[in-house]
Structure formats: C-alpha cells, structure tokens
C-alpha cells in the first residue's frame, strides 16, 4: 500500500496557546525508525517548526528547546505545539519519513489549519 498521511483539517488552540492534533500514516513497509516533522506554511513560505526521530515502540523525543511534544502509538503520532500566539495562526503540515530499514518513504499530510486567538487581558481590579 502507498504511504499516506492523514491529519485534521482544523484545530483551535486553547486560551493558553496550546494546540494538539493527531498525525496518522499508512505505512507501505515495516519501519522501525520514523522521522516526524511539523512544517508551517504561511504566505507560501514553508518553515520547519520541530522534528523528532523515534524507534517504533519507543517514545517520541523532541529537542529540549522545542515547542513541540508528542507521543506515538503504532502508526499514529499525537502532536502538541505550545506557546502559540495569534500571529502563529497558519497551516501546520505533518511530514512523515520512514527512515529504516530501507527503502526510505516520504509522506506529507494536507495540513492542519491552527487558529490561535490571543486571550483578552484581564481587567485591572481595584
């Protein structure tokens, strides 16, 4: 079967600037090493938000200073992006690469539109 990546079309970030979504992939082979990358597309510019490589059955580990965290279960990755502000609203694309064993496979989702609304500042209390 062909490599296919599915992710939700729209997600609304919480008032604390946290957005979570599931990135699920159909695998053409039995990969033991998988790399997951979150890309952000805004104004036709694509940038890398975060990336993690994990061994199947092991935990997903992002760099310490990453704004992303995640867990994996089989061919499903639960991704959480933190510290989002209104200006970070955009299309977040899940890229999945099956790294090992060969052959390598590439899969790219259609993207999740994440809407971020900055919370209203609390009124001053007397």
């Amino acid at each position: 079967k062909a490599m296919h990546v599915a992710q939700p079309a729209v997600v609304l970030a919480s008032s604390r600037g946290i957005a979570s979504f599931v990135c699920e992939y159909a695998s053409p082979g039995k990969a033991t090493e998988v790399r997951v990358t979150v890309l952000r597309q805004a104004d036709s510019q694509v940038t890398e938000v975060c990336a993690a490589t994990y061994m199947m059955g092991n935990e997903l580990t992002f760099l310490d200073d990453s704004i992303c965290t995640g867990t994996s279960s089989g061919n499903q990755v639960n991704l959480t992006i933190q510290g989002l502000r209104a200006m970070d609203t955009g299309l977040y694309i899940c890229k999945v690469e099956l790294m090992y064993p060969p052959p390598y496979y590439l899969g790219i989702g259609n993207g999740t539109q994440i809407y971020v609304i900055d919370p209203e500042p609390c009124p001053d209390s007397d």
Partner: antibody, heavy 111, light 102 residues
Framework: GVVQPGRSLRLSCAAS????????MHWVRQAPGKGLEWVAV????????YYADSVKGRFTISRDNSKNTLYLQMNSLRAEDTAVYYC?????????????WGQGTTVTVSS | QSPSSLSASVGDRVTITCRAS??????LIWYQQKPGKAPNFLIS???ILQSGVPSRFRGSGSGTNFTLTINSLHPEDFATYYC?????????FGPGTKVDIK
C-alpha cells in the same frame, strides 16, 4: 579522473555559501549521452544513507560537516560507472529534491 | 517519460508527460538541463515552481500520471527535461525529454 576497472576512486565535493550541516546531500551521475541516474543520498547529520541498486556494496557516501565536504568512495569500478558525477544539495524541507547542483566531475573507467 | 524528444518553435505550447509505475502521490520533481551544464531544479511536489522559475512553466498530476507544460516557449527553454520521483528510494529519474528547435 581516469581509473582502471576494478580499482577505487574517491570523489570530493566542497560546499560553500550555505550551512552545509543542515542539508542532506546527493550524488547523481550521467553517462556520456545518457540521462540522469541517482546514485546516493546522505542525511544532514550522516545518520541515514541510501544507494541505487547499481552501486550498492561498491560505493559509500560520507560527509565531514567540519570541513563542509561530501565524499563518494567508489570501489570495484566498472566501465559502466563512466559518467559525469554531480553532487547536489537536498532541499531543506524535502531532502529528495535537489535544489543546488555542483558543476560535475568526469570519471572514466577504462583499461 | 514521453516523448523522448520533440521539435517546437518559439511561442509554442509544449507538454511533456511522466508516468510512474506505481502511485507516488504528488512527489514528483522536474529539472531542466542544458548541454554541458548541471541540471536546474524547476518544480517540486508536482506543481510548486521554484523561486526564479518563469510562470510559463506549469506542473500537474498525481498518482501515476504527471505533466509539465511550457505555455509559450522561449528561446532559453530549448533543453532536456527530466522528471524524478521523491516518494521512495531509489529516487529514480525519467529518461528525459529533449526539446529542440523546429
């Protein structure tokens, strides 16, 4: 360079003008009067390497990020390895795309 | 990839097709190569034009059938065009299509 069949040769590709350690790198070859043939790719950190079936077990791709240099070690060379060899940068977002190419180096395998 | 070669005139609309042996989604790349030069990256992911590539170039397709269209051929467009799949290793190229002057 010219090399005899069965011998070895190492190609080098010195990169400049970009952060070499952030990009995957490829080797692609082109036999005289023929089309392009992908040879090998190495990930930005050297963690993953993949090869064409025609060179698997004979060629080794490697890199030295401290020297901004890509290598192709070619062993057990055959007449059919005669070609122009290009090094090419993998695109930042999609490594399999080759967005910047070297000018190429000619390898002739002949007795 | 077809045709293997074609003759055209400046101003012509040219269409080159690339067929994959299995579905590669939209993971297809197009390159242009002129004699004695290294290839030039034109289009990624079937239809995304690279920076500096004129808008007369257009890529389309998905699955197994892909097309590169040059809407109005310019003198500098006479070259050989290659497709390449980026879906899985080995990252194979098509045999190329040479576009020459009629």
């Amino acid at each position: 360079g010219v090399v005899q069949p069965g011998r070895s040769l190492r190609l080098s590709c010195a990169a400049s003008g970009f952060t070499f350690s952030s990009y995957g790198m490829h080797w692609v070859r082109q036999a005289p009067g023929k089309g392009l043939e992908w040879v090998a790719v190495i990930w930005y950190d050297g963690s993953n390497k993949y090869y064409a079936d025609s060179v698997k077990g004979r060629f080794t791709i490697s890199r030295d990020n401290s020297k901004n240099t890509l290598y192709l070690q070619m062993n057990s060379l055959r007449a059919e390895d005669t070609a122009v060899y290009y090094c090419a940068r993998g695109a930042r977002i999609i490594t399999p795309c080759m967005d910047v190419w070297g000018q190429g180096t000619t390898v002739t395998v002949s007795s | 990839q077809s045709p293997s070669s074609l003759s055209a005139s400046v101003g012509d609309r040219v269409t080159i097709t690339c067929r994959a042996s299995q579905s590669i989604n939209t993971y297809l790349i197009w390159y242009q190569q002129k004699p004695g030069k290294a290839p030039n990256f034109l289009i990624s992911a079937t239809s995304i034009l690279q920076s500096g590539v004129p808008s007369r170039f257009r890529g389309s397709g998905s699955g197994t059938n892909f097309t590169l269209t040059i809407n109005s051929l310019h003198p500098e467009d006479f070259a050989t065009y290659y497709c390449q799949q980026s879906y899985s290793t080995p990252f194979t190229f098509g045999p190329g299509t040479k576009v020459d002057i009629k």
